[in-house]
Amino acid sequence: TQNKALPENVKYGIVLDAGSSHTSLYIYKWPAEKENDTGVVHQVEECRVKGPGISKFVQKVNEIGIYLTDCMERAREVIPRSQHQETPVYLGATAGMRLLRMESEELADRVLDVVERSLSNYPFDFQGARIITGQEEGAYGWITINYLLGKFSQKTRWFSIVPYETNNQETFGALDLGGASTQVTFVPQNQTIESPDNALQFRLYGKDYNVYTHSFLCYGKDQALWQKLAKDIQVASNEILRDPCFHPGYKKVVNVSDLYKTPCTKRFEMTLPFQQFEIQGIGNYQQCHQSILELFNTSYCPYSQCAFNGIFLPPLQGDFGAFSAFYFVMKFLNLTSEKVSQEKVTEMMKKFCAQPWEEIKTSYAGVKEKYLSEYCFSGTYILSLLLQGYHFTADSWEHIHFIGKIQGSDAGWTLGYMLNLTNMIPAEQPLSTPLSHSTYV
């Protein structure tokens, strides 16, 4: 008789990433009997919630339930009903909510409270909604990519499972770019981490890791743009801002009240003799780059070396995975190839930014104008941040790998967060056991 497959003995987990610009729901799946193995958890679904980030619901919290409905219903469909009650659901909010909490702890708490009540209405095992720290965001991103790359596995493999996998067990650094913050996380080479706030110690699968991490609040791509606009409008002679970070011919009216609606622009706030101003794009990469550099204070460093704003940064070491908006932006610009040098990226950015807005709109007719208009800024910002902010060079650029997915799972903090909260990353190396009986019939 033919062998019949037994019912899959699998488990599921759900993590919602409540970012500054949007919320995404991720569903993960793994074989129940292999929980402690490295690399067995994989993503089976991503659902992007329609609408803005949850912090934007502060004046309309009653709309949060409806906002989350579609993706939660999708999770209901994807996960077998028999598994619903034992499927954990976690929501982690990042820098958008950190910024709201800076304004008011109560406001942030009210938003989270409504989120919790909404998520509790589903048949899953809801485990809570919280604002994760920037340190956690960096750490979990680092765990995610190294878990997916197989870096925690003690077995040396003669084959490579992913394009950028070197056969050694050297971990990858993690570079994460969001809308409101950016994180840099890596294991420095025999370097003392001079500031305790930036030091993490992990024991994973029997090995100790001393990890450096920092999250730069207000230096995600959206908040960096608000900062740049607030800085540049200070010196504008009238209500026209000729902006090198937007394509020639691009025009957009900005409300001054919107400009100052974030704690990130506080340092540039001033009284302007107008309520609105118009951005007029002039599309000049070099000038855009120069304007962006003014957001990084490199004049002060109380350590042996710094990134910017007086934040300690050890010498860069090893390969880095650059994900989230680092990847999305560079992918749009067609600059994610391993073969593209930093000089070539800069050249292509110069050409892209100089292209007239009308031409750009025609070439990318399917892309929303709001996003399309900001790729020149975002690409230039990524280069500025990596080169001047984090001190990558033309030579070390080749160590940056722009990663969207690894083995079908999105690179980002959510997988690492779930692995940690479900205790699926043991401190010690699990004893290798024979294949369980359920594997074959």
Partner: antibody
Framework: QVQLVESGGGVVQPGRSLRLSCAAS????????MNWVRQAPGKGLEWVAS????????SYADTVKGRFTISRDNSKNTLYLQMSSLRAEDTAVYYC????????????????WGQGTMVTVSS | ETVMTQSPATLSVSPGERATLSCRAS??????MHWYQQKPGQAPRLLIY???NLASGIPARFSGSGSGTEFTLTISSLQSEDFAVYYC????????FGQGTKLELK
């Protein structure tokens, strides 16, 4: 030291308008949420309106919604309350009050108060 | 709106004694409860924020406790300058105050 000084109060007829001002000093004004709280003669305290530090959240008590408008001018370190369609029940001392902080986070409690300005609505 | 009910309306206590003032919220307000003191002709003064934190410059004889719906302000040993009206205020929803407790000399 932190100082909040209200002005603009007075006697006004029902249905008319009045604008109150609160001049702030001794702190970085744009880093703090600001509020108006009132107290009718011989009565308790009643919150009127709030304006968070980055204007993310602007809110009003139901009793004044649609009639009063809170605003701020960070360059002048001044908070305003534009009151229109005034009623007899709006008669009160109006206090300007600053939001407090829980460590690095803003809080919706009131850590500093001005001395108040009296508004009397009477025909 | 969240209704705050203070009790008692008036409390008569002798100097040196302990005074306990209560405040009940009509719904849970977590620990977002704050206490103020007001003397005649003066603006209110913050005493306690977030249920149990002593405001700057306030003597240690003042303390606060509670969470959810039930909160207490305690003055361990009354001084003559403590006779005043005390208000509680919640900030979990848009701010609302209790009607006040008048602390008077017995």
């Amino acid at each position: 030291q932190v100082q909040l000084v209200e002005s603009g109060g007075g006697v006004v007829q029902p249905g008319r308008s009045l604008r109150l001002s609160c001049a702030a000093s001794g702190f970085t004004f744009n880093n703090y949420g600001m509020n108006w709280v009132r107290q009718a003669p011989g009565k308790g305290l009643e919150w009127v309106a709030s304006f968070s530090s980055s204007s993310t959240y602007i809110s009003y008590a139901d009793t004044v919604k649609g009639r009063f408008t809170i605003s701020r001018d960070n360059s002048k370190n001044t908070l305003y309350l534009q009151m229109s369609s005034l009623r007899a029940e709006d008669t009160a001392v109006y206090y300007c009050a600053r939001h407090g902080r829980y460590g690095g986070y803003g809080g919706f409690y009131f850590d500093y108060w001005g001395q108040g300005t009296m508004v009397t609505v009477s025909s | 709106e969240t209704v705050m009910t203070q009790s008692p309306a008036t409390l008569s206590v002798s100097p040196g004694e302990r005074a306990t003032l209560s405040c009940r919220a009509s719904e849970g307000v977590k620990s977002y409860m704050h206490w103020y003191q007001q003397k005649p002709g003066q603006a209110p003064r913050l005493l306690i924020y977030k249920a149990s934190n002593l405001a700057s410059g306030i003597p240690a004889r003042f303390s606060g406790s509670g969470s959810g719906t039930e909160f207490t302000l305690t003055i361990s040993s009354l001084q003559s300058e403590d006779f005043a009206v005390y208000y509680c205020q919640q900030s979990w929803n848009d701010p609302t105050f209790g009607q006040g407790t008048k602390l008077e000399l017995k």
